[in-house]
Interface confidence: medium
């Protein structure tokens, strides 16, 4: 039709100019399209340079849309992480503040001369919660051993207690149970509670990290071509009013995001495991009850030591011999009154219940994030056609889109008519992130069973702001002792504040 050959390019000029490109490139009327590399080669309003510019622009617009969607998810996960992290840290800080406020009055110098031991215990608990690679049982055992030596010395200032005598005291301690049941109870409950809290928060961190890293995966050249065809070829071919057919858009984006969709199974597993571990936040061995009440176990332990002092001393002398008397030392420490115990079970504040119910709802909402991404982007960003099937843009002309919609994931793109996908070459970044999801899921499952799991930070971007309570940057690195080191797969995500050197192992 001779009339169509001289059709004006006014609409294309308007759209192209609105994108910020120079209008001097745009032909006044349609020209022959043999030069086109992506769009069908009919009469066109696009020069080679215009086609290239629009291809680059469509590529950038899809990447931006992807990043926007990812950012919303990342922000949600980051908010959750901050809320839970703040709550758990608040529980521990509250416990430490209560200890600092009540122990000097309750225990006098038995506390004040050992304040560092208690402060360091809380620092270790914080580090443990934050994912440092240490064994909590070993840490607690060391704490009780050191504390026993110091308190025994204080309770008997009239005795000379050299290092070898203290060594003997240490060997006797397990059988004598100088602190009563408190160390055992604290060990059992704290391990379960802390491992549940830290694995949940770390799960949120890993999820957020995966989203961030996947959002940075570049779209390939085949995807760029297909997106250009989807979004701008209709303009070039003189049908600027035609919007993409929904199934056509889905096939393009399923091809473009084939690797991302492969995250789906492990992503769901991770979120399921995270929802499941919140069961461990309640009850007498639950996170809230235990983390907020560490000080009460410590008070109980010191009370037990004071109550058992005479029996303990007699048994130590029996096992280690009579220590020499210190001629300059004062008489034995007067028996102090018992330190008053706060009720062990903290009444739940309601904060955690609210946080958990919000988290569960939000995690359920984003379970199908990766496989719903093509549909979401098509409906929200691509201005799809709502007209009848034969009036939409199908990549060649205005008309019905006939091919079937592909399945999700890389393997299902073998016959994608819109994007040439090499299903034998999965994206390595995304494979690594699938592995991170698997590792974290396994850790959450172990944590659910109450097992202490070593977290090792091998964060590849070294982020972390310092905890403010123990280590900052690499001024204080956290190492695990030889006997507890293990060859575990590193989890490449640090909790906020856990620096890269915390979590290193000693060689």
């Amino acid at each position: 039709d001779p009339a169509s050959k001289s059709r004006s390019c006014g609409e294309v000029r308007q759209i192209y100019g609105a994108k910020g490109f120079s209008l001097s490139d745009v032909p006044q009327a349609e020209i022959s399209g043999e030069h086109l590399r992506i769009c069908p080669q009919g009469y066109t309003c696009c020069t080679s340079e215009m086609e290239e510019n629009l291809a680059n622009r469509s590529h950038a617009e899809l990447e931006t849309a992807l990043r926007d969607s990812s950012r919303v998810l990342q922000a949600m996960l980051a908010t959750q992480l901050r809320s839970f992290d703040d709550h758990f840290q608040h529980l521990l800080n509250d416990s430490e503040r209560t200890l600092q406020a009540t122990f000097p009055g309750a225990f006098g110098e038995l506390y004040t001369q050992n304040a560092r031991a208690f402060r360091d215990l809380y620092s270790e608990l914080r580090l443990y919660y934050r994912g440092a690679n240490l064994h909590l049982e070993e840490t607690l055992a060391e704490f009780w051993a050191r504390l026993l030596e110091r308190l025994f010395k204080q309770l008997h200032p009239q005795l000379l207690l050299p290092d070898d005598y203290l060594d003997c005291l240490g060997k006797q301690a397990e059988a004598l149970r100088p602190f009563g049941e408190a160390p055992r109870e604290l060990r059992l409950r704290a391990t379960r509670a802390f491992v549940a809290a830290r694995s949940f928060v770390q799960g949120l961190g890993v999820a957020s990290d995966v989203v961030r890293k996947v959002a940075q995966v570049p779209l390939g050249p085949e995807c760029s071509r297909a997106v250009m065809k989807l979004v701008y070829c209709a303009h070039c071919l003189g049908v600027p009013g035609a919007r993409p057919c929904p199934d056509y858009c889905r096939n393009v984006l399923k091809g473009c995001l084939a690797n991302q969709a492969d995250l789906d199974a492990e992503w769901r597993n991770l979120l399921d495991s995270m929802v499941l571990i919140t069961d461990k936040f309640w009850g007498t061995s639950g996170v809230e009850s235990v983390i907020g009440s560490v000080h009460t176990w410590l008070a109980e332990a010191i009370n037990a030591l004071q109550d058992n002092r005479d029996t303990l001393t007699a048994k130590v002398i029996q096992g280690c011999g009579n220590p020499k008397v210190n001629p300059q030392g004062p008489g034995p420490e007067e028996k102090r009154r018992r330190g008053k115990l706060a009720p062990r079970e903290r009444p739940p504040s309601g904060t955690l219940e609210k946080l958990v119910s919000e988290a569960k709802a939000q995690l359920r909402d984003v379970q199908d994030f990766w496989i719903s991404l093509p549909g979401t982007l098509c409906s929200e960003k691509m201005a799809l056609s709502t007209a009848s099937d034969d009036r939409c843009w199908n990549g060649m002309a205005r008309g019905r889109y006939l091919p079937e919609v592909m399945g999700d994931g890389l393997a299902n793109q073998i016959n994608n008519p819109e994007v040439e996908v090499d299903i034998t070459k999965p994206d390595m970044t995304i494979r690594q992130q699938i592995m991170q999801l698997k590792i974290m899921t396994n850790r959450l499952r172990s944590a659910y069973n109450g097992n202490d799991v070593d977290f090792q930070d091998a964060s590849d971007d070294g982020s972390g702001s310092g905890s403010g309570d123990g280590c900052l940057d690499d001024l204080c690195s956290r190492k695990v002792s030889r006997k507890s080191s293990s060859s575990r797969t590193p989890l490449t995500h640090a909790l906020p504040g856990l620096s890269e050197q915390e979590g290193q192992k000693t060689s």
């Epitope: 600092q100 304040a115 560092r116 031991a117 360091d120 620092s123 240490l134 060391e142 050191r146 290092d163 070898d164 203290l166 060594d167 310092g466 403010g468 123990g470 280590c471 900052l472 940057d473 001024l475 204080c476 690195s477 956290r478 190492k479 695990v480 002792s481 000693t506």
Partner: antibody, heavy 122, light 105 residues
């Protein structure tokens, strides 16, 4: 009596690495944190590095962070300081010190000092 | 860093007080004496006011809030030295020292 003997000092080349060793005796080594403290000519004391009794906690002064590594060997009762990428400002006396505490890294807890080993980076 | 006066002077028999501030409240201080540059420091007091057995009782320590004070009661000529305080940086958990106070008797 507690004794701390430092060795490994001397004239060093800028950019190279330095390894200092402190041999401890007269106390139960595995019970206490150990530190390295240095003093540049005409200057005050500066905390270089410390290590807790178990070897799990280490702390570093800001001037050496990223260049220093402290380690301990309880079997040998030694503490080692490795300082990489030496600079002229690393010149000074390096003292080994014992803490009264098992915990790293508080400079309020030092109860014994070695005689020091002189390091000259030139 | 910890803040100390650069110098103090006293006559024999007088009481001298050297202050050290800038540490984190709730953390202890130690006091160390160095008689000549390059000689090994000697611990006078550790963890606020614990005195090693060979240190004379005229050296004592106290702490109020985040300021520590070393008191030398009845100062003697042999006390002429540089005195350093030490504590811990509560954020980095690394040791810190004051710049030193020169005592002239």
């Amino acid at each position: 009596a507690v004794t701390l003997d430092e060795s490994g000092g001397g004239l060093q080349t800028p950019g190279r690495a330095l390894s200092l060793v402190c041999k401890a005796s007269g106390f139960t080594f595995s019970r206490y944190a150990m530190y390295w403290v240095r003093q540049a000519p005409g200057k005050g004391l500066e905390f270089v590095a410390g290590i807790g009794n178990t070897g799990r906690y280490t702390g570093y002064g800001s001037a050496v962070k990223g260049r220093a590594t402290i380690s301990r060997d309880s079997g040998q009762s030694t503490v080692r300081l490795q300082l990489n990428n030496l600079r002229a400002e690393d010149t000074g006396n390096y003292y080994c010190a014992k803490s009264v505490s098992p915990y790293c890294c508080d400079a309020a807890d030092i109860d014994a000092w070695g005689h020091g080993t002189e390091v000259i980076v030139s | 860093a910890l803040t100390q006066p650069a110098s103090v002077s006293a006559n024999p028999g007088e009481t001298v007080k050297i202050t050290c501030s800038g540490g984190s409240s709730g953390y202890a201080y130690g006091w160390y004496q160095q008689k000549s540059p390059g000689s090994a420091p000697v611990t006078l007091l550790y963890s606020n006011n614990n005195r090693p057995s060979d240190i004379p009782s005229r050296f004592s320590g106290s702490k109020s809030g985040s300021t520590a004070t070393l008191t030398i009661t009845g100062v003697q000529a042999e006390d002429e030295a540089v005195y350093f305080c030490g504590s811990v940086d509560s954020s980095s958990y690394a040791g810190i020292f004051g710049a030193g106070t020169t005592l002239t008797v």
